[in-house]
């Protein structure tokens, strides 16, 4: 893991360079001021202690300054995400300075050696920032370090070593191996900047987690639970990206953090919102769609500064590509039955009808099981803005469409063989929009017919704004 001692150590001695290139002494880190959106433009290389390039290249001392820090590389070249990010930053912040930190020679090595070089690179960035601070009008408050993978921890070291406090660090899927569980001074952590926000897109609880699982910032956002990213499955990758191997799936999911950040820069009008939650499972159940007390935030560049005492883990669902925004809904369905039906695992689908559009048929993901005579909470999300919801169609899937469903049906039958007429009653559905925080209640279209069974459907119409019904003493008590 990275070496523990402070910025005063003999850092150059730590460099893990291939023997062949140790002869010529050159700075191992270069700073390229990207002076054009054109990725082919060579930009300007900044040199510590040399003010002329700053003037010649139009470095704006009063503007925001972004430092983009790449991660470990197998190819030794800048990957294509880099110029996408540079271009997006230039588009969003026209006057900003966009600096690419080139530490390719130190990153194009065995992963363990590259990890051991992160501290040295962080120190180089800190020295550059210290030098810039000597200039009139340059403020660390305007500095935003954006580090991808191993680069996120480099940013952490830079923030730790610099004299003063940088304004912001964004960690884009910070690297996991050799950093998971590490001491705060040996990885990205909240004390490395005034505001540290993190996107986690490739975390795995089994096997190797390329991205770090633990929260390391003031806010840690886990899109799609931080693991399986839509559009990155083997089938998707085979069809749409170069190569089409497991390696590409890994790359797709790990790099998704960068694209989510780019999306937040270029699709300002379509911000994605994340919601605070203790874990991914609770989020999948639809429990965590509150915006009260800073419990929700925009993701990526638009994230609002939150400096909590504790790490804040936040979750959201996304589309498979840009724009990534989806619309989240919490659905509370009180399911009751007149007979004891034993363990029952219905496969429910909903279709939402709105003033702008209608949703596709959406599955209600049952995270654990359906509780009878109780309120069940679900999360559904749509790719399009439906507008104001008007009605909901709830369907209980009939004939099994998969081996899993067939097994569910069989298991259900074996537990209750003498109960062929499986039937549940649902009188109303309560819906809350994550994006608008609006609460609505939908009542069964036919109050006399609230029963649903396999292969059947129920229709619900909006019957009031808000959740409390007239004559209702408590929202949790449902009378048949």
């Amino acid at each position: 893991s990275p070496t523990p001692f402070g910025p005063e150590g003999q850092l150059e001695d730590e460099l893990h360079k291939p023997k062949a290139i140790q002869t010529e002494v050159k700075p191992s880190v270069r700073f390229n001021l990207r002076t054009s959106k054109d990725p082919e433009h060579e930009g300007c290389y900044l040199s510590l202690g040399h003010s002329q390039p700053l003037e010649d290249c139009g470095f704006n001392m009063t503007a925001k300054t972004f430092f983009i820090i790449h991660g470990w590389t197998m190819s030794g070249i800048f990957e294509n995400w880099l110029h996408k990010l540079v271009s997006a930053l230039h588009t969003r912040e026209k006057d900003a300075n966009v600096v690419v930190v080139d530490w390719l020679p130190l990153a194009h090595q065995l992963y363990t050696d590259a990890v051991n070089n992160t501290r040295v690179v962080g120190h180089s960035i800190a020295r550059m920032l210290d030098w810039l601070q000597e200039k009139d009008d340059f403020s660390l408050e305007n500095v935003h370090l954006i580090g991808y993978s191993l680069g996120a921890h480099v940013a952490g070291y830079a923030g730790n070593f610099v004299k003063g406090t940088v304004g912001r660090i964004t960690g884009l899927d910070p690297a996991g191996p050799m950093f998971e569980g590490a001491d705060i001074h040996k990885r990205l952590s909240p004390d490395d900047a005034d505001f540290v926000d993190v996107l986690h897109t490739y975390t795995r609880s089994f096997g190797l987690s390329i991205g770090i699982q633990m929260p390391v910032g003031h806010i840690d956002i886990y899109p799609n639970g931080g693991d399986f990213q839509p559009g990155c499955g083997l089938n998707d990758v085979l069809g749409s990206m170069a190569y089409g191997t497991i390696t590409e799936v890994v790359k797709c999911e790990h790099e998704r953090a960068v694209h989510l950040f780019v999306d937040s820069l270029v699709n300002q009008d379509k911000p994605s919102f994340a919601f605070q939650c203790t874990d991914s499972n609770r989020f999948k159940k639809g429990i965590c769609l509150s915006c009260r007390k800073n419990r929700c935030n925009s993701i990526g560049y638009n994230a609002k500064k939150m400096r909590n005492k504790r790490n804040s883990k936040m979750y959201l669902k996304t589309r498979a590509g840009m724009p990534f925004r989806v619309y989240h809904y919490q659905m509370k369905i009180h399911v009751f039955s007149y007979k004891n039906m034993g363990e029952i695992e219905p496969t429910f689908y909903v279709t939402l009808y709105g003033t702008n559009a209608d949703s596709q048929t959406l599955p209600l993901e049952i995270v654990e099981r359906i509780e009878q005579n109780a309120t069940n909470t679900f999360l559904v999300y749509t790719e399009e803005d439906l507008g104001d919801l008007l009605k909901i169609q709830l369907t209980w899937e009939g004939a099994s469409q998969s081996w899993y469903n067939l097994w569910k049906e069989l298991r259900s039958y074996l537990s209750q063989p003498h109960n062929p007429g499986r039937e549940l009653n649902i009188r109303r559905i309560r819906v809350k929009s994550g994006e608008t925080q609006r609460k609505l209640t939908f009542c069964a279209e036919d109050p006399e017919n609230t029963s649903i069974s396999p292969g059947r459907e129920l229709w619900f119409r909006k019957c009031r704004d808000g959740w409390r019904m007239k004559n209702e003493t408590s929202p949790t008590v449902e009378l048949p």
Partner: antibody
């Protein structure tokens, strides 16, 4: 203007070592990567690999690992290709070509080529 | 490695007509909306010359009669109207994130 000027043609005996040069001018040498491309007589182009002109770190295509070596003389803005234990199948024209580190990696300027021929 | 297959291997086109050269990749060379496919022209005794990069972008100084199109695995170079000086061999090349960067086998264009 931007130019890549390569050393002249050479006749080599099998087993010998040959080193060809590619001198860059008109741009900052260390700001662009340098590729090497082989073209056997009457055949197509084959990418051999590239060298980071700033760090000196070379990357070789699988078919060119072992007997081939890329190197630099940064002060002279020159890249070199060395072929050890020259073989008959090394008879070809070798091109150097630069690419932008920051862009889409296409080869925008090429050297005129150096013809290497095996003599028996 | 990504294999690029060019077709036809050679073609003869009358002056002023359209020449169409195809390049098929064994896997997609697309990345986030961009296609990492380039086209080069090579005349006998000369080095290759870049014509088109990122599938459809014309390099400055190259005549507008050259155009590129395609995405994913299928790409096309069009020359219209063909001129005498366009007689050459044309190569496609992919430059995706991870080398090796490969070339197609080449298409020899003859002017009738």
């Amino acid at each position: 203007q931007i130019q890549l000027v390569q050393s002249g043609p050479e006749l080599k005996k099998p087993g010998e070592t040959v080193k060809i040069s590619c001198k860059a001018s008109g741009y900052t040498f260390t700001n662009y990567g340098m590729n090497w491309v082989k073209q056997a007589p009457g055949k197509g182009l084959k990418w051999m690999g590239w060298i980071n002109t700033y760090s000196g770190v070379p990357t070789y295509a699988d078919d060119f690992k072992g007997r081939f070596a890329f190197s630099l003389e940064t002060s002279a803005s020159t890249a070199y290709l060395q072929i050890n234990n020259f073989k008959n199948e090394d008879t070809a024209t070798y091109f150097c070509a630069r690419f932008s580190y920051y862009g889409r990696h296409y080869f925008d300027y090429w050297g005129q080529g150096t013809a290497l021929t095996a003599s028996s | 490695d990504i294999v690029l297959t060019q077709s036809p291997a050679s073609l003869a086109v009358s002056l002023g007509q359209r020449a169409t050269i195809s390049c098929k990749a064994s896997q997609s060379v697309d990345y986030d909306g961009d296609s990492y496919m380039n086209w080069y022209q090579q005349k006998p005794g000369q080095p290759p010359k870049l014509l088109i990069y990122a599938a459809s972008n014309l390099k400055s100084g190259i005549p507008a009669r050259f155009s590129g199109s395609g995405s994913g695995t299928d790409f096309t170079l069009n020359i219209h109207p063909v001129e005498e000086e366009d007689a050459a061999t044309y190569y496609c090349q992919q430059t995706t994130d991870d080398p090796p960067w490969t070339f197609g086998g080449g298409t020899k264009l003859e002017i009738k």
